[in-house]
């Protein structure tokens, strides 16, 4: 099956930049987001620190670490209230992602 221009293969994601006007200085500001073409039963999430299609049950239950959001060799922990997760690098640096 051939993909049309701008069409994503099933189960894949890409990062897109959305421009919107304007801040108080009339500057165009941008927001980056992921665009995913997920299969049935999947939803946009994060795997190995990249946008990915993940099992929708993970999102519903907020078991974020089941997405394997951190890099290999890093530890994953849920934030209090399951509002996101932290990835702990081998040397102890932490990276926190909150889900809005």
């Amino acid at each position: 099956q051939f993909l049309k221009e701008g069409q994503l293969a099933a189960g894949t994601c890409e990062i897109v930049t959305l421009d919107r006007c304007c801040n108080k200085n009339r500057r165009t500001i941008a927001r980056q987001t992921a665009r995913c073409a997920c299969r049935k039963g999947q939803i946009a999430g994060t795997t190995r620190a990249r946008p990915a299609c993940v099992d929708a049950r993970i999102i519903k239950t907020k078991q974020w670490c089941d997405m394997l959001p951190c890099l290999e060799g890093e530890g994953c922990d849920l934030l209090i209230n399951r509002s996101g997760w932290t990835c702990t690098q081998p040397g102890g640096r932490i990276k926190t992602t909150t889900v809005s």
């Epitope: 620190a49 890099l71 934030l79 209090i80 932290t86 702990t88 690098q89 081998p90 040397g91 102890g92 640096r93 932490i94 990276k95 926190t96």
Partner: antibody
């Protein structure tokens, strides 16, 4: 709103020990790391060290021994500096260190002069 | 010793022009992409522009573009505006277990003609 504010900067004489405090609001120190960075007048940014909850602090190689970073409460991180010299004259910033350093505090000025 | 070399140290550009700033690390940054760019104006703390080499920080204009991986990174500012006059810094993250966690480049001063 996520905010950091540094305090404790002042004019001191060489050899003094000084402790700066970074007070955070709008986010939890149990979930985020904090870095201390300094900037001498007219110079560039210099990373001093980093602390994350439940982990030992990490320091720039030049800062080891004379600088100590500690989490002193659920909302404060201290930077203790000993044997200060005129070379330590700078604005000291703390910043939430996550995906990049953001946000930053406004900074506190430390002047070391005899 | 960890080192981030930023070039050039100063650059001039006309309004509407394009500026490119380079940052070279003495060793690969963590995950090959943990590099950030900041803008700093006199009397202010630095402002995060880009993290993870190419991801725009919230509310930053898409005129700022980051690229690169490993040890070589670039910040490109297109359609330069008067408000872009500032000093720009790169900051690399490294594994805390083996070296300094962070290092900054020496800065690039952008002057608008």
């Amino acid at each position: 709103q996520e905010q950091l504010v540094e305090s404790g900067g002042r004019l001191v004489t060489p050899g003094t020990t000084l402790t700066l405090t970074c007070t955070v609001s709008g986010f939890s120190l149990s979930s985020y790391g904090v870095s201390w960075v300094r900037q001498a007048p007219g110079k560039g940014l210099e990373w001093i060290g980093y602390i994350a909850n439940n982990y030992n602090p990490h320091y720039a190689s030049w800062a080891k021994g004379r600088f100590t970073i500690s989490k002193t409460s659920s909302t404060t991180v201290d930077l203790k500096m000993t044997s200060l010299t005129t070379e330590d004259t700078a604005t000291y910033f703390c910043a939430r260190d996550n995906y990049g350093m953001d946000p930053w505090g406004p900074g506190t000025l430390v002047t070391v002069s005899s | 010793e960890l080192d981030l070399t930023q070039t050039p140290s100063s650059v001039s550009a006309a309004v509407g022009g394009t500026v490119t700033i380079n940052c070279q690390a003495s060793q690969s940054v963590y995950n090959n992409k943990n590099l950030a760019w900041y803008q700093q104006k006199p009397g202010q703390p630095p402002k995060l522009l880009i993290y993870a080499a190419s991801t725009l920080a919230s509310g930053v204009s898409s005129r700022f573009k980051g690229s690169g991986s490993g040890t070589q990174f670039t910040l490109t500012i297109s359609d330069v505006q008067c408000d872009d006059a500032a000093t720009y810094y790169c900051q690399g993250e490294f594994s805390c277990s083996s070296a300094d966690c962070n290092a900054f480049g020496g800065g690039t001063e952008l002057e608008i003609l």
